[in-house]
Each structure stands twice: as structure tokens, then as C-alpha cells.
């Protein structure tokens, strides 16, 4: 039975041109995390495999940095980056857990800076 839960930053906002850390955390399970996939609705951003390291999709190579940890740092934000992001945890023996983050990229300095994993 899958007992784990994914904690995410939930809804976060950031300024255009700035950076944001997308971070999820799997808790309440002893399952081994074998891989984490980071996705938007219709495309892959990156994969972190416990053994093989990072894969970053070519469309994001210039502005995505691996980490910290299993998270992902998204740089040079544009308003087009607004939307849903998903962390998909592949675990053994539990299977797959999915977390959701909604990012809003704002035009001006009205972005909140209170999100737990956000870069100021």
C-alpha cells in the first residue's frame, strides 16, 4: 500500500527575469526514491535518476539548473512560465507519487517573496 505523501510549495509567485526553486518532498514512506521527473503539462523539464544523475530537456538547458537536491532551479523567468509544474517521484516498492506546484510569473515587483523554497 502507498502510504507516502508529497509536500510541495503549492502556489508560488516570482518576478519576470528572476529565479525560482521548484521543490517537492516525499514523506511518510520508507520507499526508496529511484528517480524524480519534473514536468509541465505537455513537456519534460528534467529527470534526476539516483544512479545516472540528471537529464535536462534541450528546451530548458539554458535556464534550468539541477538542484538543490532533487529540486529544480528555473532561471530567467518569463510570463510564459506561468502554469502548473509536476514532480513525479518514482519509488520502490511503492510506485509513483505526483506533486503539483502552480507558478505565477509577475511582470513587476508585486511578486510575493514568502514561499518557503523561493529564491529572493
Amino acid at each position: 500500500m502507498m502510504t507516502g505523501t508529497i509536500e510541495t510549495t503549492g502556489n508560488i509567485s516570482a518576478e519576470k527575469g528572476g529565479s525560482i526553486i521548484l521543490q517537492c518532498h516525499l514523506s511518510s514512506t520508507t520507499a526508496q526514491v529511484t528517480q524524480v521527473n519534473w514536468e509541465q503539462q505537455d513537456q519534460l523539464l528534467a529527470i534526476c535518476n539516483a544512479d545516472l544523475g540528471w537529464h535536462i530537456s534541450p528546451s530548458f538547458k539554458d535556464r534550468v539548473a539541477p538542484g538543490p537536491g532533487l529540486g529544480l532551479t528555473l532561471q530567467s523567468l518569463t510570463v510564459n512560465d506561468t502554469g502548473e509544474y509536476f514532480c513525479i517521484y518514482h519509488t520502490y516498492p511503492d510506485g509513483t507519487y505526483t506533486g503539483r506546484i502552480f507558478l505565477e510569473v509577475l511582470e513587476s515587483s508585486v511578486a510575493e517573496h514568502g514561499a518557503r523554497f523561493q529564491i529572493p
Partner: antibody
Framework: QVQLQQPGAELVKPGASVKLSCKAS????????IYWVKQRPGQGLEWIGG????????NFNENFKSKATLTVDKSSSTAYMQLSSLTSDDSAVYFC????????????WGQGTLVTVSA | DIVMTQSHKFMSTSVGDRVSITCKAS??????VAWYQQKPGQSPKLLIY???YRYTGVPDRFTGSGSGTDFTFTISSVQAEDLAVYYC?????????FGGGTKLEIK
């Protein structure tokens, strides 16, 4: 330029083991994973597994976990795959491949080693 | 394991024709798909990845598209040298898997 050099062929007896080599040149060996792919005569491609040369970590296709051992020798920029308890099903061409920068896709391929298992 | 299905084992075409090869994943693989070309007696070569990026030096007659479970590889104007087997492959989750291959035959 990037090169992955593999011996052309190995003839081995059933039940024996064989250690295949893949010598890398033209890039920093520890910066890119090495993967191994099997192709039986006239058949398709099958991913065996990969090794991260910087730390020796390996990831296997479950079908090959008890068949293949992946290692690296950083000093000679060489990756190895040992195949054990060989049977006729192991007769195939074995390719070593290398990924792209931060990419899992197989950008560079060796010429392949033909392993023939025969008494 | 994720199964990658190439519905056509063989495809016959003429020089100058447009040809499309399809690949269907048994489950979601996002855009983690690549296409390889293998000519007789040679190692495979990376043509397309992620799944619409042309690899260095690959002619622009080769294109790819798709997301999720359905992927297409297209040669806009087939040349005689395109005689080969074409494989799709997913790297969304291990074990990474290939399609069975589609052999392109020139009429």
C-alpha cells in the same frame, strides 16, 4: 572528436564469462555516463544498463541484473561489461554508448562487439 | 516496463516521397523520446531527441513530434541513403526501452 572503441568480436564457450571493453577518448571520461545496448542478429535493440563513471553507480534493466556487471577504469578511460554464465541467448552484438550533455539520449556509439557463444 | 510499439515493421517508399513512422508508448513518457537510424552493418545513430530536436549534423528532412504517448518521425523527402531501420526509444523511466524498429525500404 568523441570515440568509443570496442573490440570487433569475442568467441566464448557456454557457461564461461566474457569481459567487453569500451575505450573512450575525445572528452572527459568521468563527465558522461556509459550505457550498454544488446542487439541479437536480425533483431532490435535492448538497453542493458548504464554506469556513472564519476562514482561507479549503475542502473540495470532487471532482465540483465544477474547477467551483466558494469565497471569503469578511470585511469584508462575505459568502461567494461562482464557477462557471466553465457548461453546461446547471449550471442549478440553489444554496443557501448555515451549520452549527450545533461542528456540521456545515446549521442555516441561504439562499433559494437559481436559475442558468439559456441562450444 | 514501458512498451514502445512501432506499428509498421516494414514501410516501402519511393525516393522523393514523404514518409512518417509512428511510435506509441504503453504509458505516459512526456517528451522523453529519441529516434535512431541503423543502416545495415552499422551502429545506430541518433537523429532526433526530446522528441523534435535534430541532432548535430542531421539533415533537416528528418523531423520528429509528439508528447505523452504518441510520437511521429517524418522524412519529408526520402533519399536512397535513408534505407535503414528506424527505432524510437523512451528514457522517461528505467528500464529504457526501444520500439521494435521500422525497416524503410526504397522501391
Amino acid at each position: 572528436q568523441v570515440q568509443l572503441q570496442q573490440p570487433g568480436a569475442e568467441l566464448v564457450k557456454p557457461g564461461a564469462s566474457v569481459k567487453l571493453s569500451c575505450k573512450a577518448s575525445g572528452y572527459t571520461f568521468i563527465s558522461y555516463n556509459i550505457y550498454w545496448v544488446k542487439q541479437r542478429p536480425g533483431q532490435g535493440l535492448e538497453w542493458i544498463g548504464g554506469v556513472n563513471p564519476s562514482n561507479g553507480n549503475t542502473n540495470f534493466n532487471e532482465n540483465f541484473k544477474s547477467k551483466a556487471t558494469l565497471t569503469v577504469d578511470k585511469s584508462s578511460s575505459t568502461a567494461y561489461m562482464q557477462l557471466s554464465s553465457l548461453t546461446s541467448d547471449d550471442s549478440a552484438v553489444y554496443f557501448c554508448t555515451r549520452g549527450n550533455y545533461y542528456g540521456y539520449e545515446f549521442a555516441y556509439w561504439g562499433q559494437g562487439t559481436l559475442v558468439t557463444v559456441s562450444a | 516496463d514501458i512498451v514502445m510499439t512501432q506499428s509498421h515493421k516494414f514501410m516501402s517508399t519511393s525516393v522523393g516521397d514523404r514518409v512518417s513512422i509512428t511510435c506509441k508508448a504503453s504509458q505516459h513518457v512526456s517528451t522523453a523520446v529519441a529516434w535512431y537510424q541503423q543502416k545495415p552493418g552499422q551502429s545506430p545513430k541518433l537523429l532526433i531527441y526530446s522528441p523534435s530536436y535534430r541532432y548535430t549534423g542531421v539533415p533537416d528532412r528528418f523531423t520528429g513530434s509528439g508528447s505523452g504517448t504518441d510520437f511521429t518521425f517524418t522524412i519529408s523527402s526520402v533519399q536512397a541513403e535513408d534505407l535503414a531501420v528506424y527505432y524510437c526509444q523512451q528514457h522517461y523511466s528505467t528500464p529504457w526501452t526501444f520500439g521494435g524498429g521500422t525497416k524503410l525500404e526504397i522501391k
